[in-house]
């Protein structure tokens, strides 16, 4: 039976007469698209999220839903509107036959339709001989309140709120949206139903084994007793949080999503909207030993995505699988054998493993940071999490070879104190998706809305690329990398920084065609060079060698190949000062690095010369890495010589402001 409502027939009759008065046609030239989960077993055909265009009002959403019902009824199909979305995304959730998709896609205001799909808890119960205590304990860094100014929302299973670890700390909301458990003989046992959520609530704010002991939590039930939920249920949960935030604005909000499903455009869009409303979202990278970008909400750029490591800082193996990895992961955190509240009794504890536990650690750290500095934006918080992480401690050999360069080698840690970070110029590296191998393929890397793109570089494993450039897109600079003929594809790498009151622009010099090579500098008064990029149209730049060292007294200048156009990123910001640091190796080498010294932050990373045997340049923390083709293929000719060029900046203004605060 498609519909349980007795008044269904009446509704259809009422709508049939209404339908013809709704003759708005979809706008010309825009076609709504249909999306579904790439993982077949996780698909839930028969339930669809119809997402409407951004400015659609609630009344229009309701009208569009009614129109769909009326048109479906005319064709003899039953439909049921399960939910009308507003507050986060305009749209509605409908139960209907897949035969109606074509019809639904033609409705006015429709942007896209997504078939519902499953999401899953990301923890593995683990048998232990010995239990390792959580590696980062809250007593290492405790603001007076331990996160008390922050509210953490947990979207998970039901929880045992009277457990001694979380009693009085977790408010169970009346929100519940879960699918039926699988299997006819499934026996609902309270302790099993509450297992996942209780443990995670304990990891975040548990009285004795929690990270942010002062944080208060609110739980929403979106996962059933088997740890399974739906994209639509999660969306409705996120909408509930947004509405709660609007009704009763409180202090900083952290939302913990310890779940994962297949890539979902709509779930990512909802996360983006909530993040832009000032909410910090933290999610599990997923336990599939796979690229996190293939899963949601892990793949949403606005969400802080957390992979799992063990006490030895190694990626966590979970049975035959393990932690996800890749460019969509922001950082890793302890996620193996984590002790937390067990729902078996109010004084029971259990060890669980997974990226859910890792995400709970980061949610706790975020709550503590926000409690100490409630005004932090999402971008500032993310940058601080990265800055205070333990660097280069993960054994990258565990990751597939093609993912090693893309995966951040960062393990979350609590800041040593609540002060002293304000003066720092924070930057992070953002990798694009792979461009694909076609001749004209490009890849784009973007910074978060309140970050500045200070430099742009590119990387190709085959070395066949045509460089990169910074360009304006929607009023913001983006970093675009270009593939070359015969290339297997490129990555664009953006260096994204927090630079308040910055005014940045890109200065370009076209190919010089002269023997001296191409040069460009920052000519505006008070503007300093933060990054250099070069882009060329020719397939192979050849062996022309420009002068590697720039002339004395020209620090504000980018130098490049005569056949390439050179782009300088020039910024003006209070107290900003930058310097160029180069490290050249005369003999060919697969990797050349140059690092900025203590107190300076790497903003730009590029290679000289830009010839085709250079695979590209990218920043890893405060080090500029230039990769070249295997030495054996280049030979030891002078062409093999490569220089890594780092641009290191600091902000005297931020330092002074910080000193004044203390």
């Amino acid at each position: 039976q498609e519909d349980e409502d007795g008044d269904y027939e009446e509704l259809v009759l009422a709508l049939r007469s209404e339908e013809d008065g709704l003759a708005e046609a979809p706008e010309h030239g825009t076609t709504a698209t249909f999306h579904r989960c790439a993982k077949d077993p996780w698909r839930l055909p028969g339930t669809y999220v119809v997402v409407l265009k951004e400015e659609t009002h609630l009344s229009q959403s309701e009208r569009t839903a009614r129109r769909l019902q009326a048109q479906a009824a005319r064709r003899g199909y039953l439909t049921k509107i399960l939910h009308v979305f507003h507050g986060l995304l305009p749209g509605f959730l409908v139960k209907m036959s897949g035969d109606l998709l074509e019809l639904a896609l033609k409705l006015p205001h429709v942007d896209y339709i997504e078939e519902d799909s499953s999401v899953f808890a990301q923890s593995i119960p683990w048998n232990l001989e010995r239990i390792t205590p959580p590696r980062y304990r809250a007593d290492e860094y405790q603001p007076p309140d331990g996160g008390s100014l922050v509210e953490v929302y947990l979207l998970d299973t039901s929880i045992q709120s009277d457990h001694r670890e979380i009693e009085g700390r977790v408010m169970v909301t009346d929100f519940e949206n879960v699918p039926e458990e699988d299997g006819t003989r499934f026996h609902r046992q309270a302790s099993k139903c509450d297992s996942h959520g209780t443990h995670l609530a304990g990891v975040v704010s548990g009285r004795d084994a929690g990270v942010a002991k002062g944080a208060s939590m609110r739980s929403l039930r979106v996962l059933n007793c088997q740890g399974k939920g739906t994209v639509s249920g999660t969306l409705i949960g996120l909408e509930f949080i947004r509405k709660s935030q609007l009704v009763q604005p409180v202090g900083p909000l952290v939302v913990l999503l310890p779940l994962a499903g297949g890539y979902s455009r709509v779930l990512n869009a909802a996360c983006q909207r909530l993040a832009r409303a000032g909410v910090v979202l933290v999610t599990a990278a997923g336990n599939f030993r796979d690229d996190a970008c293939l899963y949601s909400p892990a793949s949403a750029p606005e969400v802080i995505t957390v992979g799992a490591t063990n006490a030895q800082d190694q990626p966590v193996t979970l049975g035959t699988l393990g932690t996800n990895f890749g460019r969509c992961v922001d950082l890793f955190a302890p996620g193996e054998d984590i002790i937390g509240a067990s729902s078996d009794c109010s004084t029971c504890f259990v060890s669980q493993s997974g990226t859910s536990q890792a995400a709970a650690h980061v949610a706790g750290i975020a709550a503590m940071m926000l409690s100490a500095e409630p005004e932090l934006t999402l971008a500032e918080l993310r940058q601080r999490l990265i800055h205070f992480s333990a660097k280069d401690v993960i054994n990258e050999a565990w990751f597939p070879e093609d993912q090693r360069v893309l995966t951040p080698n960062l393990v979350a840690a609590l800041p040593p104190s609540t002060h002293g970070a304000g003066w720092q110029l924070f930057c992070r590296t953002v990798w694009s998706a792979h461009s694909g191998p076609t001749r004209m393929a490009t890849a784009v890397a973007r910074c978060a809305p309140d970050e500045e793109l200070l430099s742009c570089s590119s990387f190709s494993r085959s070395g066949k690329r045509r460089g990169e450039r910074m360009e304006a897109q929607g009023g913001k600079l983006v970093c675009r990398a270009h593939n070359a003929f015969g290339g297997e594809g490129v990555y664009a790498i953006a260096r994204c920084c927090l630079l308040p009151q910055a005014n940045c622009s890109v200065h370009t010099a076209p190919p010089a065609e002269a023997s001296m090579g191409t040069r460009v500098h920052c000519h505006q008064q008070g503007h300093v060079l933060t990054g250099c990029s070069s882009h060329w149209e020719v397939e192979d730049l050849g062996t022309h060698k420009p002068p590697v060292l720039r002339p004395r007294g020209q620090p504000n200048q980018c130098v490049g190949h005569r056949e390439a156009s050179i782009h300088a990123s020039c910024c003006h910001a209070p107290g900003l000062e930058c310097k160029v640091k180069e490290h050249g190796i005369p003999a060919p080498q697969e990797q050349v690095t140059v690092a900025c010294e203590e107190g300076w932050t790497l903003t730009g990373c590029s290679a000289l010369p830009g010839t085709s045997h250079v695979l590209g340049a990218y920043a890893v923390d405060n080090t500029c890495v230039v990769r070249s083709r295997d030495v054996s293929t280049t030979g030891s000719t002078s062409e093999g010589a490569v220089t890594a060029v780092a641009i290191c900046c600091r902000s005297r203004h931020l330092a002074q402001a910080s000193q004044e605060l203390q």
Epitope: T132, S346, T347, C348, Q352
Partner: antibody, heavy 131, light 106 residues
């Protein structure tokens, strides 16, 4: 049978700290979960907190949170209780007592049940707080 | 925290009497209750655990019953060495003790 031997009586000034020790003999110390219970003169018993060696965490009663620290040294089979910011009402006999950490196998997990059943007690340490 | 209320707070009895002490929990604690005996200047001694299980070495004249919120300790025939203070203690959550019942010689 586990024997618990506590350190001697202490006289402390208000605002200072006291650290009482409890040495276990008989049985494996690693399996000894130790709680601390105090009794003010003429009053009843009050649980302060416990150390759970297998779990690697200490649990504290809400009332004492932030003021009490319970630790254990496996090498000497000794548990410690430190109480800071002492006031006159902290004058009491402080007992260490062994409780249990019971392992329950459920759903492929090892669940640890903190069973606060005190079968073995130390002789008690009188702490007097007076100016 | 779970509150434990003992009654009576004191009682006078003679050797050979049957004595009953009750303990009430502020919320259901299943059978997570222990009974202790304490003599002046000494540490408490465990008599009954899990509501009704006699600790080894404890005479069989001691028995415990109840579950949920209401519990009882019974001494079937009071002996001279039984004059002491008795405490109930729950362990369903953080351990809390009753205020004690003093058993005195009539």
């Amino acid at each position: 049978q586990v024997q618990l031997v506590q350190s001697g009586a202490e006289v402390k000034k208000p605002g200072s700290s006291v650290k009482v020790s409890c040495k276990a003999s008989g049985g494996t110390f690693n399996s000894h979960a130790i709680s601390w219970v105090r009794q003010a003169p003429g009053q009843g018993l009050e649980w302060m907190g416990g150390i759970n060696p297998i779990l690697g965490i200490a649990n504290y009663a809400q009332k004492f949170q932030g003021r009490v620290t319970i630790t254990a040294d496996e090498s000497t089979s000794t548990a410690y209780m430190e109480l800071s910011s002492l006031r006159s009402e902290d004058t009491a006999v402080y007992y260490c007592a062994r409780h249990y950490e019971i392992q329950i196998g459920r759903y492929g997990m090892n669940v640890y049940y903190l069973m606060y059943r005190f079968a073995s007690w130390g002789q008690g340490t009188l702490v007097t707080v007076s100016s | 925290d779970i509150q434990m209320t003992q009654s009576p707070s004191s009682l006078s009895a003679s050797v050979g009497d049957r004595v009953t002490i009750t303990c009430r929990a502020s919320q259901g604690i299943r059978s997570a209750l222990n009974w202790y005996q304490q003599k002046p200047g000494k540490a408490p001694k465990l008599l009954i655990y899990n509501g009704s299980t006699l600790q080894s070495g404890v005479p069989s004249r001691f028995s415990g019953s109840g579950s949920g919120t209401d519990f009882t300790l019974t001494i079937s025939s009071l002996q001279p060495e039984d004059f002491a203070v008795y405490y109930c203690q729950q362990f369903d959550g953080d351990p809390t003790f009753g205020q004690g019942t003093k058993v005195e010689i009539k």
